[in-house]
Amino acid sequence: SAGAGSHCQKTSLRVNFEDIGWDSWIIAPKEYEAYECKGGCFFPLADDVTPTKHAIVQTLVHLKFPTKVGKACCVPTKLSPISVLYKDDMGVPTLKYHYEGMSVAECGCR
Amino acid sequence: SAGAGSHCQKTSLRVNFEDIGWDSWIIAPKEYEAYECKGGCFFPLADDVTPTKHAIVQTLVHLKFPTKVGKACCVPTKLSPISVLYKDDMGVPTLKYHYEGMSVAECGCR
């Protein structure tokens, strides 16, 4: 698992729609793999965290002034859709094949 | 200023190229406004932090399981270029009008 000391990476995050109160309109699935981006953005930033120039700059400034400037943050840089069965306005069960931006495809340092 | 208790926002971050060791190839400017994204991504996520669906989900899961799942992170969501004067391979001072991704244009919760 990606602890605080580990590098930025994608980790498992199973989300149950009942837990977040979305079961009132999402019929299925009951839960899904959302993933989570966890870990630190440490110097030097590796290519696999696809750092922007700003993230590189911020990392270097943090290295010099750690109390003044924070590190870059490990966040989703690419998201994937999931398919959901939901109730429309008329209460009709409807399948949405691509419910965008629900699951992490890639993590990076930003 | 945006402390830990404040909401995600863009704050000033003046970067001196000498401080980060880039003065060896960037001739001018000597420093620039990079900005930094600071503050928390608290529930409910406001429209101005342009949250993705995943960020909304993660925020809701964090609300229910704060020790298991982290909050979404306040990061640059749009970057701007700056202009820099640098030396090319022949040592000729050359202006790059659009050195992309160097300054924060917008922050958001991801």
Epitope: - | K30, Y32, S83, L85, M90, P93, L95
Partner: antibody
């Protein structure tokens, strides 16, 4: 070693034409803006024209004093730049320098060639 | 066009002393935090040579006795200590806007 060698200038009558050429070596010619800068006898320096890169569609710019009369061109395959001068005036007399550089500075200079416009 | 005006037109300084040449632009030649100001040296019978670029940076192979300063509209070239081989005409030049323009030149001689 960077070298810019201008063709020989000479004497031309007012209203006449002359073509200058400049052969470059010692640097990647196609990566640099090329310019002509002139200097009237005992006077200061005056930028005449420049031509940018292929990626800029070889855009050209001219000093107001020569616009419509002078044409700058380049041949990257020959590492050469040219200045076609038409409708020459006595005030065009001077040393013409071929210069190469960036979008910021005149970095490389030729030795110059003297153009004299006189009847 | 941006007009560059140098002062003085000529200058005589003793060997080992400091020579100061000023250049004023008709409008600011700064943009993006960069000064679009260069200095050239021209010795008799030779083409100009880049001395200082971006107001304060030395060109390749330029001795440390040459320094530049200034921003906006007012710039200075300083030569210290002056040596015999520094006898030349010095030109300031802006590259902020086309047409790129030069100052009229300052002739430096030994007193």
């Amino acid at each position: 070693e960077v070298q810019l060698v201008e063709s020989r200038g000479g004497l031309v009558q007012p209203g006449g034409s002359m073509r200058l050429s400049c052969a470059a070596s010692g640097f990647t010619f196609s990566n640099y803006w090329m310019n002509w800068v002139r200097q009237a006898p005992g006077k200061g320096l005056e930028w005449v024209a420049h031509i940018r890169l292929k990626s800029d569609n070889y855009a050209t710019h001219y000093a107001e004093s020569v616009r419509g009369r002078f044409t700058i061109s380049r041949d990257d395959s020959k590492s050469s730049v040219y200045l076609q001068m038409n409708s020459l005036k006595t005030e065009d007399t001077g040393i013409y320098y071929c210069t190469g550089g960036s979008n910021y500075v005149f970095a490389f200079w030729g030795q110059g060639t003297l153009v004299t416009v006189s009847s | 066009d941006i007009v560059m005006t140098q002062s003085p037109d000529s200058l005589a300084v003793s060997l080992g002393e400091r020579a100061t040449i000023n250049c004023r632009a008709s409008e600011s030649v700064d943009n993006y935090g960069i000064s679009f100001m260069n200095w050239f040296q021209q010795k008799p019978g030779q083409p100009p040579k880049l001395l200082i670029y971006a107001a304060s940076n030395q060109g390749s192979g330029v001795p440390d006795r040459f320094s530049g300063s200034g921003s906006g509209t007012d710039f200075t070239l300083t030569i210290s200590p002056l040596q015999a081989e520094d006898v030349a005409v010095y030109f300031c030049q802006q590259s902020k806007e086309v047409p790129w323009t030069f100052g009229q030149g300052t002739k430096l001689e030994i007193k």
